[in-house]
């Protein structure tokens, strides 16, 4: 077929028609509709919303919309036996108890089924003991405590502030340090921006507000009972003792009013430096235990949550491609929320809904995309990316052969300052070109492009005149597509000014106060930032599904591979003597990167020149582009993390949210000076260099002329 046979209008006009159809007022209306009651995974309310979305996507004009269900392990508090933490005196009497629920926001006092704050998948238990304050509970915080301050957390209950890293990593670190319980709290230093009122008068966290969240360490496994395979009707489930990633000690989150009561009595060691002090009027003493007058008092946790196999529902919509129906571009975001989901996820789900409506409108006018577009409303993201992972496990053979790209669509906003994009290097040029065509919504940038405001506000640290684009980490539904299957992926949202706002995430994240009103009153009253995010996400999907040649530039991968090789080499060179002793060389990696660069350059030249009217050659070149991301997958996975298979990127072993480059080498080098067997440790570094060099070389060869 000719390149444009799929459409009844020119490609440029198609994109314009699609973008012009997106309306801020619709996104606002959809957000309101999605946020009036809680939609916790595994509940009837979230099932009803799945059916509503299925029905509306059908009305919008998609070819088919199906529910895909799975029975996965979820976690809920006990309704009659609430979780809380006490300070107990020497007689065991509870002299202070933490709150049982958050004070509901105005207008929501009579809403039922608001799940109280809890740490999902915490085991049951009632440990009691002395408290140790561990700052953010990062790897480096425990190094400071154990190595520098000689403080032993074994048998202690640790209290850690939220922020900086994924909460599951905090719990894992506490477990490894021997703690018998973990209390997580939100410090105003991280969740209260100066000069802003707390909700309902502003977007800051009130003292009674608490962040919910799962505390798993799944490393990409999906449902803890069925790693690698879908949790379907005939699934074989592991016993709970063999489940993947479950914490072994009780964990519970609290707000800063309650944290004040626990921390104000802390004794023992003073904080090691100012980076350990938050904004509460407490000494931030590390402990262990309470100070003089209160030294006989202890902390006791009361955790009664249960893990239950529960049915979840994804909504999968299909818009069949006219020319290449066997090539899939996927737009997915989750639907389940902790409570109302005003930002997470419904600001994203409302944008997806409007994107589906716009595509449906074009389809009703006779247009079809060149490639198939799949739309997904994922369930149980908050419980460990379960819905997306189970669906990808069920459809892995199709996806690895047909998956062109995955665009994630969780929260559209985490601020209203500028754009934030994390994606594969293959998409850099697509994002640059698209944002140059879109109008900036920012004040002071009227009539300017989104690219211009984004570049001004968030400049690239390496390349002047270009915006920052970050590595993909995890903590969201792109994980299985990118890290396990090697499908080119990207995400975009509006964010805060990271220079001036040092708090982690947005203050009301995963609290009861994440409401429609939070967005409508404080973040985006005109829904212009939501509209911009819809244009970016939708525009990316449109280009990926409709451009004749896939909008991937392999030369950008070459550039970052060199940067990442330089970075990991410089880390290794902090140990020059050992590198010499154990004959550690990065020559093979640098050689592979050089080969990749040369081959990518030649491929790009051929891409300019080939006969695009020849459908076989076009398909061949597009397949080389599509399969390039796949070529970075190692079927054996990373050490002890079999579902993280991408050799160039993986979630950091110390923070699931962050991406790490050459993660196999990085982890082999991490803290290598403390390893008991240096010969073995440096041997593993050499092995990881070998794996990385081989993978880069093998990927390069997929771009060579085929014969």
């Amino acid at each position: 077929k000719s390149s444009n046979e799929a459409t009844n209008i020119t490609p440029k006009h198609n994109m314009k028609a699609f973008l012009d159809e997106l309306k801020a007022e619709n996104i606002k209306k959809f957000l309101y509709n999605f946020t009036q009651i809680p939609h916790l995974a595994g509940t009837e309310q979230n099932f009803q919303l799945a059916k509503q979305i299925q029905s509306q996507w059908k009305e919008f004009g998609l070819d088919s919309v199906e529910l895909a269900h799975y029975d996965v392990l979820l976690s809920y508090p006990n309704k009659t036996h609430p979780n809380y933490i006490s300070i107990i005196n020497e007689d065991g009497n509870e002299i202070f108890n933490t709150s049982l629920f958050e004070p509901p926001p105005p207008g929501y006092e009579n809403v039922s089924d608001i799940v109280p704050p809890f740490s999902a998948f915490s085991p049951q238990g009632m440990p009691e003991g002395d408290l140790v304050y561990v700052n953010y509970a990062r790897t480096e915080d425990f190094f400071k405590l154990e190595r520098d301050m000689k403080i032993n957390c074994s048998g202690k209950i640790v209290i850690a502030r939220y922020g900086k890293v994924f909460r599951g990593n905090k719990v894992k670190n506490a477990q490894l340090a021997g703690a018998k319980g973990v209390i997580l709290y939100s410090d105003p230093a991280d969740y209260f921006a100066p000069g802003v009122k707390s909700y309902p008068d502003g977007w800051n966290l009130p003292g009674g507000g608490v962040q919910r969240g799962n505390i798993l360490n799944l490393n990409g496994a999906g449902d803890p009972l069925t790693p690698g395979y879908p949790a379907n009707e005939y699934a074989y489930r592991r016993g709970i003792a063999e489940a993947v990633g479950l914490p072994s000690i009780p964990v519970h989150p609290i707000g800063y009013y309650d944290a004040q009561k626990l921390l104000e009595k802390m004794g023992g060691s003073a904080p090691p430096d100012s980076s350990w002090r938050g904004s509460l009027k407490v000494p931030y003493n590390v402990g262990p235990g309470f100070t003089g007058n209160f030294s006989t008092q202890k902390v006791k946790m009361h955790i009664h949550s249960t893990n239950e196999v529960t049915r979840i529902y994804n909504v999968i919509g299909t818009l069949r491609g006219a020319v290449e129906p066997d090539r899939y571009v996927i737009l997915g975001g989750h639907r389940d929320s902790w409570v109302f989901g005003g930002i997470d996820p419904q600001s994203g789900a409302a944008v997806v809904h409007e994107i589906v409506r716009s595509f449906g409108t074009l389809k009703k006018e006779g247009w079809r995309p060149r490639r198939t577009i799949l739309f997904a409303s994922w369930d149980a993201e908050e419980f460990g990316l379960l819905g997306s992972t189970e669906w990808a496990e069920e459809n892995s053979r199709l996806l690895q052969e047909r998956g062109v790209a995955y665009i994630n669509a969780d929260s559209s906003i985490e601020g209203n300052y500028t754009l934030r994009v994390d994606c594969t290097p293959l998409m850099y040029s697509l994002v640059h070109n698209l944002t140059k065509e879109l109008k900036s919504p920012d004040e002071g940038f009227e009539g300017k492009s989104l690219y211009e405001s984004w570049t001004k506000k968030s400049p690239s640290p390496e390349f002047s005149g270009m915006p920052r684009i970050s590595k993909l980490g995890s903590g969201n539904d792109f994980e299985v597509f990118f890290q396990r299957l090697g499908i080119a992926s990207g995400r975009a949202r509006y964010t805060k000014n990271w220079e001036t706002n040092k708090f982690s995430g947005y203050p009301l994240y995963h609290s009861v106060y994440e409401t429609y009103e939070l967005v409508e009153k404080f973040y985006d009253p005109m829904f212009k930032y939501h509209l911009t995010v819809a244009q970016v996400r939708g525009g990316m999907v449109f280009e990926l599904a409709n451009s004749i040649v896939l909008p991937f530039d392999c030369r950008d991968y070459a550039v970052v591979l060199r940067k990442y090789a330089d970075k990991i080499y410089s880390i290794s060179m902090k140990h020059p003597q050992e590198m010499k002793t154990y004959s550690v060389s990065f020559d093979s990696l640098f050689s592979a990167v050089k080969n990749f660069t040369e081959i990518a350059s030649k491929f790009s030249e051929r891409l300019q020149d080939f006969d695009k009217s020849n459908p076989i050659v076009l398909r061949m070149m597009n397949d080389q582009l599509m399969f390039l991301e796949r070529a970075f997958i190692d079927p054996l996975g990373l050490p002890d993390r079999p579902f993280y298979r991408h050799v160039i990127y993986a979630p950091s072993s110390h923070n699931k949210y962050a991406g790490e480059s050459f993660p196999g080498i990085y982890d082999a080098l991490f803290d290598i000076e403390s390893k008991v067997d240096p010969s073995k440790a440096w041997g593993e570094v050499k092995r990881q260099i070998y794996v990385a060099a081989f993978t880069v070389q093998a990927a390069a060869e997929t771009l060579s002329e085929v014969a």
Partner: nanobody, 123 residues
Framework: EVQLLESGGGVVQPGRSLRLSCAAS????????MNWVRQAPGKGLDWVAF????????YYADSVKGRFTISRDNSKNTLYLQMNSLRPEDTAVYYC????????????????WGQGTMVTVSS
């Protein structure tokens, strides 16, 4: 209109019991800590008891500890004070008072008061 209305006061013999109620209207009781405060004839105000918004913590003045129990029913928007083993020195006008801070874990300043209910303990 935002208001608190106390009831249940009366004359009672020493050693007997009484239960005071305080009905809130015009605002949701569920978000606020609540207090009972009393004023004996010719004396100043004395704080009696406090309960957090969620009922997880209760604090009492030493003079009533072990005898009085503060409780609440958020679904009924009502605060209670169960007074057992009453003594003549418990004679006072009892006021309920709303804590000013949403979600406070300890008593703070009060911003809404009831009109009070008189309790007389006399033989």
């Amino acid at each position: 209109e935002v208001q608190l209305l106390e009831s249940g006061g009366g004359v009672v013999q020493p050693g007997r019991s009484l239960r005071l109620s305080c009905a809130a209207s015009g605002f949701p009781l569920i978000s606020y800590g609540m207090n009972w405060v009393r004023q004996a004839p010719g004396k100043g105000l004395d704080w009696v008891a406090f309960i957090t918004y969620d009922g997880s913590n209760r604090y009492y003045a030493d003079s009533v500890k072990g005898r009085f129990t503060i409780s609440r029913d958020n679904s009924k928007n009502t605060l209670y004070l169960q007074m057992n083993s009453l003594r003549p020195e418990d004679t006072a006008v009892y006021y309920c008072a709303k804590d000013r801070i949403v979600g406070a874990r300890v008593p703070d300043a009060y911003d809404i008061w009831g009109q009070g209910t008189m309790v007389t303990v006399s033989s």
